[in-house]
Interface confidence: medium
């Protein structure tokens, strides 16, 4: 009942989680025009990853798209990269984890195939979530140094010459949801491969019952189970995963490529 | 090389109206905020009226209001200040100038153009 | 609105003299304070933004300093060229106001 609340909140948490990721990576807010300490102006800039906008204080905006692929910056590429690789990849885990829901049938599927689609779910969440709170983060630390549209560049009345000024942007809305998108799918991620642990059928040690005839000794082995090798066998519950079975302290970790937090 | 020309001052009787313009060039006009700044004979600076880039945001002195209105036309990259009810303190030299909005300053003006208000 | 005052509102200096105007705003402005210089007949000339950032292709004897209400414009070593009517307009809020004018004259 545990692994099945475990596996359900997990596919739950990691479906905000996406469905957060989709949602920043859409939204123009990614960066915003710091009001805190600007000259007076009715105009109010914010940018996201596809498009910038600008509103009034008359309430009128309008967004212009970033039509070109080759003039934008690497970094802002990497980030809109970042972004969609986690959405595709939670994406698939969603799909995968549905079908690894132990509270749905299908078929006759067995329990060691769910086990294995809850894994493998849960490690694309967690890869999901780290690709998009790299991706926020790569932008967030854009903004912190002025790497990308950090600069206003306007032309004075001497003759055409450039005057570069400081454009004073700060943290967007976009970047916050992304940071707890991120997070939350990569709990749920975490959460599924804990349900996996739980998920695999249990090797069930049946003592084996004797029957004295002939004055020699016949060991019975049920059909259908394995045998025991007596009474003094090793009861130590293991868990059976594709590709052999392993005891609980040879369960391979994992290891992160995305080392970006 | 960026620069605003300015047209349409003259003469004209107290009550009338006039419609100056301010032709942009050298700069991506419709991404600038702009403003019309006057300076009576003798006098110091005045601002008058400011409007976005869109155009769809104004804003104007409390001297002025309800009888100027600034506009613009991006495709033409032109400013305009309609101005109606003239009165004899209207007489100035009206200038339209580019507002910095990132230093809040203008950083770009016109020759300026005189209006004359009188009978 | 926020009201401009500027002091002098005329001072007679010499070449090579070191000039110094006061601006001060009715109200807390910031750091959002714009100098220009004027020559009659001609259009205002963007000297100083921000309070104390120097504007391209000005020289660099002309300075700014000062924040929210006091703000001052030196000319380090007057040239002829100098002479001229220099107003200060702050841009913390709207309506955009301008202080009243220094006039700079030959002593």
């Known amino acids: 009942m545990a692994v099945t609340a475990c596996q359900g909140l997990g596919f739950v948490v990691s479906l905000i989680g996406i469905a957060g990721i989709i949602a920043a990576t859409c939204m123009d807010q990614w960066s915003t025009q710091d009001l805190y300490n600007n000259p007076v102006t009715a105009v109010f800039n914010y940018q996201g990853l596809w498009r910038s906008c600008v509103r009034e204080s008359s309430g009128f905006t309008e967004c212009r798209g970033y039509f070109t692929l080759l003039g934008l910056p690497a970094m802002l590429q990497a980030v809109r990269a970042l972004m969609i690789v986690g959405i595709v990849l939670g994406a698939i885990g969603l799909l995968v984890s549905i079908f690894a829901l132990k509270c749905i049938r299908i078929g006759s599927m067995e329990d060691s195939a769910k086990a294995n689609m809850t894994l493998t779910s849960g490690i694309m969440f967690i890869v999901s979530g780290l690709c998009a709170i790299a991706g926020v983060s790569v932008f967030a630390n854009m903004l912190v140094t002025n790497f990308w549209m950090s600069t206003a560049n306007m032309y004075t009345g001497m003759g055409g010459m450039v005057q570069t000024v400081q454009t004073r942007y700060t943290f967007g809305a976009a970047l916050f949801v992304g940071w707890v998108a991120g997070g939350l799918t990569l709990i749920g991620g975490v959460m599924m491969c804990i349900a996996c642990r739980g998920l695999a059928p249990e090797e069930t040690n049946y003592k084996a019952v004797s029957y004295h005839a002939s004055g020699h000794s016949v060991a019975y082995k049920p059909g259908g189970f394995k045998a025991s090798t007596g009474f003094g066998s090793n009861t130590k519950n293991k868990k059976i995963y594709d590709g052999g079975a392993r005891t609980e302290d040879e369960v391979q970790s994992y290891p992160s490529k995305h080392d970006y937090v | 090389q960026v620069q605003l020309v300015q047209s349409g001052g003259g003469l004209v009787q107290p009550g009338g109206s006039l419609r100056l313009s301010c032709a942009a060039s050298?700069?991506?006009?419709?991404?600038?905020?702009m403003n019309w700044v006057r300076q009576a004979p003798g006098k110091g600076l005045e601002w008058v009226a400011y409007?976005?880039?869109?155009?769809?945001?104004?804003y104007y002195a409390d001297s002025v209001k309800g009888r100027i209105t600034i506009s613009r036309d991006n495709a033409k990259n032109s400013l305009y200040l309609q101005m109606n009810s003239l009165r004899a303190e209207d007489t100035a030299v009206y200038y339209c100038?580019?507002?910095?909005?990132?230093?809040?300053?203008?950083?770009?003006w016109g020759q300026g153009t005189l209006v004359t208000v009188s009978s | 609105d926020i009201q401009m005052t500027q002091s002098p509102s005329s001072v007679s200096a010499s070449v090579g003299d070191r000039v110094t105007i006061t601006c001060r705003a009715s109200?807390?402005?910031?750091?959002?304070l714009a100098w220009y210089q004027q020559k009659p007949g001609k259009a205002p000339k963007l000297l100083i933004y921000?309070?104390?950032s120097l504007q391209s292709g000005v020289p660099s004897r002309f300075s700014g300093s000062g924040s929210g209400t006091d703000f001052t414009l030196t000319i380090s070593s007057l040239q002829p060229e100098d002479f001229a009517t220099y107003y200060c307009?702050?841009?913390?809020?709207?309506?955009?106001?301008f202080g009243g004018g220094t006039k700079v004259e030959i002593k």
């Open positions: 050298g700069f991506t006009f419709s991404s600038y905020e």
């Open positions: 921000a309070a104390s």
């Open positions: 100038a580019r507002y910095w909005n990132y230093a809040g300053g203008m950083d770009v």
């Open positions: 109200q807390g402005i910031s750091s959002w």
């Open positions: 409007i976005t880039g869109s155009g769809r945001t104004m």
């Open positions: 307009q702050q841009a913390n809020s709207f309506p955009l106001t």
